[in-house]
């Protein structure tokens, strides 16, 4: 049945959508759909989206490209990296500061602001586990340092001071009377 | 019986515009692609607007491009025209048609037509 | 655009005798192997009535003395008695890509 040369396409497959009259190719990833395919199994005009706006996918339908998001100032968010057609933008917190979820069940898409991490060399603690998703996990007293209450305090430099039996394990004195 | 009834024709001065209506019955309108296709005086057939149904997207020929819009209201099962800046050369009878797709082949033919609608572009 | 040429423009024949029309577009029309291409009949004062569609196939209702044939660029519709109704215009019509173009109509008259 004459010699055709026509591709055959499934309107139903992944390559080719029905836009409009015709199944059209779609467009790339960062590009949005002018106007459809002028043939069967055609290729659609797609257009890059423009300066501030993208689409991560390959699509078929996206007659204008989405806005790219501004990261939240107020939440002290920061772009990890810049928009681009195919990305949007992608905002956490600077070194030094965590995220903190403003939602119980948390999702890469959740709100969150972010938190400056807890310095444990400010502490004069050991750091447990650096900050990066949640805060900072100190652990013991530095040496020269022991517990008392919440905090570390630092051992005696001279048999004056007293020394209780915590601070005597750890700095080595014994209470003086 | 399928039927097409088509209104809105008439004079215009160059530069007007004017609005074509064409009213389907016997078929479910939703269903199908709609076309104009235009006849200047003594002259051949020349296709000027097609909607597409259930997305409705539009396409022209680049003689009418940008001064001429095809719609459609699936509610009142009614295809329109608008034509704006209408030129000397946009004088012509006016028919609505419908698009009838052949099988999974993306093939039209227009299978049912309107009566026409004269429409004169003069000063 | 796709240009279809129809050839001749006015063609005289006698009552009962056959008929040939002629439309040659300037590129295939075919697709997946059937040629988007018809042929449609007008009488004065009266809209285009579709014949045939896909080049061969006859449309319901359209009397069987009508056919069309040929594939790619070169088609034909033939009238193999001509009656007196059809001694009207006929043109040729692709649907393989927008524009949808119409080959410039053929003038039947009796001879």
């Known amino acids: 049945q004459g010699g055709t040369r026509s591709p055959r396409c499934d309107c139903a497959g992944d390559f080719h959508k029905k836009i409009g009259l015709f199944c059209c190719r779609g467009c790339p990833a960062g590009h949005y759909l002018k106007a459809p395919c002028t043939e069967p199994c055609g290729n659609s005009t797609c257009l890059v989206c423009p300066q501030d706006t993208f689409l991560a996918w390959e699509n078929h339908h996206n007659s204008e490209c989405a806005r790219c998001q501004a990261c939240d100032e107020q939440a002290s968010q920061v772009a990890l990296e810049n928009c681009s057609a195919v990305a949007d933008t992608r905002c956490g917190c600077k070194p030094g500061w965590f995220v903190e979820c403003q939602v119980s069940q948390c999702v890469s898409s959740s709100p969150f602001y972010c938190q400056p991490c807890l310095d444990c060399g400010a502490l004069h603690r050991h750091t447990r586990l650096l900050c990066s998703r949640r805060d900072t996990d100190c652990g013991t007293c530095l040496p020269g340092f022991y517990e008392h209450g919440d905090g570390c305090v630092s051992c005696p430099t001279s048999t004056l001071g007293s020394c209780p039996e915590r601070c005597a394990a750890v700095c080595g004195w014994r209470q003086m009377f | 019986q399928v039927q097409l009834q088509q209104s809105g024709g008439g004079l215009v001065q160059p530069g007007g515009s004017l609005r074509l209506s064409c009213a389907a019955s016997?078929?479910?309108?939703?269903?199908?692609?709609m076309s104009w296709v235009r006849q200047a005086p003594g002259k051949g057939l020349e296709w000027v607007a097609t909607i597409s149904d259930g997305d409705s997207y539009s396409y022209f020929p680049d003689s009418v491009k940008d001064r001429f819009t095809i719609s459609r209201d699936n509610a009142r099962n009614s295809l329109y025209l608008q034509m704006n800046s209408l030129r000397a050369e946009d004088t012509a009878v006016y028919y609505c048609?419908?698009?009838?797709?052949?099988?999974?082949?993306?093939?039209?033919?227009?299978?049912?037509w309107g009566r026409g609608t004269l429409v004169t572009v003069s000063s | 655009d796709v240009v279809m040429t129809q050839s001749p423009d006015s063609l005289a024949v006698s009552l009962g005798e056959r008929a040939t029309i002629n439309c040659r577009a300037s590129?295939?029309?075919?697709?997946?192997?059937?040629?988007?291409m018809q042929w449609y009949q007008q009488k004065p004062g009266q809209p285009p009535k579709l014949l045939i569609y896909?080049?061969?196939n006859v449309e319901s209702g359209v009397p069987d003395r009508f056919s069309g044939s040929g594939s790619g660029t070169d088609f034909t519709l033939t009238i193999s008695s001509l009656q007196a109704e059809d001694v009207v215009v006929y043109y040729c019509q692709q649907s393989r890509k927008l524009p949808y173009t119409f080959g410039g109509g053929t003038k039947v008259e009796i001879k």
């Open positions: 016997g078929f479910t309108f939703s269903s199908y692609a």
């Open positions: 048609a419908r698009d009838r797709i052949y099988g999974s082949v993306q093939y039209y033919a227009m299978d049912y």
């Open positions: 896909a080049a061969s």
């Open positions: 590129e295939s029309v075919e697709f997946s192997g059937t040629s988007l």
